[in-house]
């Protein structure tokens, strides 16, 4: 004979676990249905009735199978130094990342909480380590024989041009000036500009922290029946 299929809610046998997409309700002491992503538990199960699920309201979401009593609030709108890379839906939170020219100074589980403008190396200094999505530019003084005459988050120190006859010697912030005879440019390895980091932003506005930082359902646990493990042990 085929095994009898238990319909939720049901009392699990000793040492057995609730099935996938079910949870053990500590109050009812039964295995009950979870709610699908985009829904939440409107009414918890009892000995005789299963979980009643309802859709998340606008600007709220649940990302996982769950039995949270309320959907999570989506994070607030992305600030001016950010761009929305994932919209708020009933099944996922809004994700904000930093604009070009900015990096993430304070990350959150997904996206960025606080963006900051990439450091610009002033004349006499070049980029030692370029900025990334999550780290600032590192500047270094131009070594003898190199210079940078720009204020830039991407320019490295470049070698002075080599003159047949030097009119004005170069320094850290200025190239050598040659007399009218054509200069011989030293062979500098690589390009003059470093590539921009993948997620960089405009350099005008100050960074503003995102006020709302709702956690994702992957670590939000309901304060109700029991923890949302996919298969909870139940008797």
């Amino acid at each position: 004979l085929p095994a009898q299929v238990a319909f939720t809610p049901y009392a699990p046998e000793p040492g057995s676990t609730c099935r996938l997409r079910e949870y053990y309700d500590q109050t009812a002491q039964m295995c009950c249905s979870k709610c699908s992503p985009g829904q939440h538990a409107k009414v918890f199960c009892t000995k005789t009735s299963d979980t009643v699920c309802d859709s998340c309201e606008d600007s709220t979401y649940t990302q996982l199978w769950n039995w949270v009593p309320e959907c999570l609030s989506c994070g607030s709108r992305c600030s001016s130094d950010q761009v929305e890379t994932q919209a708020c839906t009933r099944e996922q939170n809004r994700i904000c990342t930093c604009r070009p020219g900015w990096y993430c100074a304070l990350s959150k589980q997904e996206g960025c909480r606080l963006c900051a403008p990439l450091r610009k190396c002033r004349p006499g200094f070049g980029v030692a380590r370029p900025g990334t999505e999550t780290s600032d530019v590192v500047c270094k003084p131009c070594a003898p024989g190199t210079f940078s005459n720009t204020t830039s988050s991407t320019d490295i120190c470049r070698p002075h041009q080599i003159c047949n006859v030097v009119a004005i010697p170069g320094n850290a912030s200025m190239d050598a000036v040659c007399t009218s005879t054509s200069p011989t440019r030293s062979m500098a390895p690589g390009a003059v500009h470093l590539p921009q980091p993948v997620s960089t932003r405009s350099q005008h506005t100050q960074p503003t922290p995102e006020p709302s930082t709702a956690p994702s359902t992957s670590f939000l646990l309901p304060m109700g029946p029991s923890p949302p493990a996919e298969g909870s042990t139940g008797d």
Partner: antibody
């Protein structure tokens, strides 16, 4: 296998407090609630209430409000029963019992209140 | 809360004879195809030991001379052939309601 190990016997004076511990092993502590049961000398079993081991929310049976507090330390899979302002009539064996449809029991902790 | 009334209070049975203990609930303990009545054995100085769960299911490791029956409000624990080691107090317990309750206990002795 499921095991509930309780702290040892206590002898207390009236008015004092006592804290009984119940350490769980062999299962995920936060999946099942924990009940507390009292058995006075020569008497039957008396359900005191339970605590949701996930949320930490306690429920107390009639007659066990006020002086009785259930608490948890989930980091060490342990439930606690604290009784304050002890009276002679609190002398009993206190059991923790894992709350499923039926119980798995601790070995019991004898609390004696005597002047 | 649900009240469980156990009878008799005590019971003396000859070795090898049948022992029957009853437990009546003040309201139905049956829901979702289960009766949430459980039976425990307690010996002096020991915690209660589960014998029967959900009215009629024999707990692993418990001798099959123990059996449980009943539904809704009336339940019975039967020891088909009493052994010396069965001398103990037996309790019924309900988990139909959020608040558990126990019966008053039945002391089983050898006649």
């Amino acid at each position: 296998q499921v095991q509930l190990v309780q702290s040892g016997s206590e002898l207390k004076k009236p008015g004092a407090s006592v804290k009984v511990s119940c350490k769980a092993s062999g299962y995920t502590f936060t999946t099942f609630g924990m009940s507390w049961v009292r058995q006075a000398p020569g008497q039957g079993l008396e359900w005191m209430g339970w605590i949701n081991t996930y949320s930490g929310v306690p429920t107390y049976a009639q007659g066990f409000t006020g002086r009785f507090v259930f608490s948890l330390d989930t980091s060490v899979s342990t439930a606690y029963l604290q009784i304050s302002s002890l009276k002679a009539e609190d002398t009993a064996v206190y059991f923790c019992a894992r709350r499923s449809n039926f119980a798995y029991w601790g070995q019991g902790t004898l609390v004696t209140v005597s002047s | 809360d649900i009240v469980l009334t156990q009878s008799p209070d005590s019971l003396a049975v000859s070795l090898g004879e049948r022992a029957t203990i009853n437990c009546r609930a003040s309201e139905s303990l049956t829901a979702s195809g289960n009766s949430f009545m459980h039976w425990y054995q307690q010996k002096p100085g020991q915690p209660p030991k589960l014998l029967i769960y959900r009215a009629s299911n024999l707990e692993s490791g418990v001798p099959d001379r123990f059996s449980g029956s009943g539904s809704r409000t009336d339940f019975t624990l039967t020891i088909s052939s009493l052994q010396a080691e069965d001398v103990a107090v037996y309790y019924c317990q309900q988990s139909r309601h959020v608040n558990w309750t126990f019966g008053g206990g039945t002391k089983v002795e050898i006649k």
